[in-house]
């Protein structure tokens, strides 16, 4: 099966790499604009220069293109705890990330929030915190893992998953209560 090409891809594929078909004259191949620039005017004829202009402040193009406008620079989302790793330049978008001892949780493909790495109190670090993944903790005896925190088995309700992990402790508590009755 031949993959379906969009109109722009069809037009580009007729020209050699680094060139695109003139939108008004399909016998002309114009040179694409370099990254950091955008298309101001198509080339007037074969072998003639495309009129490319540099992106203005607050915008960029990261690859060769024939875009009529540069792309707007991304802004790091303060409300999501994001910080700027590197600022936007004419040929590269802003890079956002998280502070030290934080990880990124992606709510969707292009939206992440920064959260503090778990410290594994009342447990040990099984896997260290990574850029896109929280610490994985293993809990000490008498504690169970709830939302990546080690919680005392005294907080384990019988209906919860923790009953398997806390079973000896639950029985001890029950045994203690029973022995207290006369």
């Amino acid at each position: 099966l031949v993959p379906h090409l969009g109109d722009r891809e069809k037009r580009d594929s007729v020209c050699p790499q680094g060139k695109y078909i003139h939108p008004q004259n399909n016998s002309i191949c114009c040179t694409k604009c370099h990254k950091g620039t955008y298309l101001y005017n198509d080339c007037p004829g074969p072998g003639q220069d495309t009129d490319c202009r540099e992106c203005e402040s607050g915008s960029f193009t990261a690859s060769e293109n024939h875009l009529r406008h540069c792309l707007s620079c991304s802004k790091c989302r303060k409300e999501m705890g994001q910080v700027e790793i590197s600022s936007c330049t004419v040929d590269r978008d802003t890079v956002c990330g998280c502070r030290k001892n934080q990880y990124r949780h992606y709510w969707s493909e292009n939206l992440f929030q920064c959260f503090n790495c778990s410290l594994c109190l009342n447990g040990t670090v099984h896997l260290s915190c990574q850029e896109k993944q929280n610490t994985v903790c293993t809990c000490h005896a008498g504690f169970f893992l709830r939302e990546n925190e080690c919680v005392s088995c005294s907080n384990c309700k019988k209906s919860l998953e923790c009953t398997k992990l806390c079973l000896p402790q639950i029985e001890n508590v029950k045994g203690t209560e029973d022995s207290g009755t006369t």
Partner: nanobody, 119 residues
């Protein structure tokens, strides 16, 4: 006790509009960034939009950009979602929630309001 109560859902034809509201109580609403998420039948939660504390900074999922508008009225402790040019794929239960703080889970969210887009 924290309460979030969504309203405004219903049956609407493709291309139609709805305005969802979320009445908040039990916490300082003006201090919390707020979120709209949705769950389509048989699918997972999808982040739709969020808004910062003062209503200046907003975010929209690509699927709703240009059609939905999030806003808030801190004097009324209410969050809104104006939904225009509705499509069948917008059919879902819509929930409001406060932006998670300690980890990737919603500490407080409402019971949801069902939006059905169908002709």
């Amino acid at each position: 006790e924290v309460q979030l109560l969504e309203s405004g859902g219903g049956l609407v034809q493709p291309g139609g509009s709805l305005r969802l509201s979320c009445a908040a109580s039990g916490f300082t609403f003006a201090h919390e960034p707020m979120v709209w998420v949705r769950q389509a039948p048989g699918k997972g939660l999808e982040w739709v939009s969020h808004i910062d504390r003062v209503g200046q900074d907003t975010y929209y999922a690509d699927s709703v950009k240009g059609r939905f508008t999030i806003s808030r009225d801190n004097s009324k402790n209410t969050l809104y979602l104006q939904m225009n040019s509705l499509r069948a794929e917008d059919t879902a239960v819509y929930y409001c929630a406060s932006l998670p703080k300690r980890g990737p889970r919603f500490d407080y969210w409402g019971q949801g309001t069902l939006v059905t887009v169908s002709s």
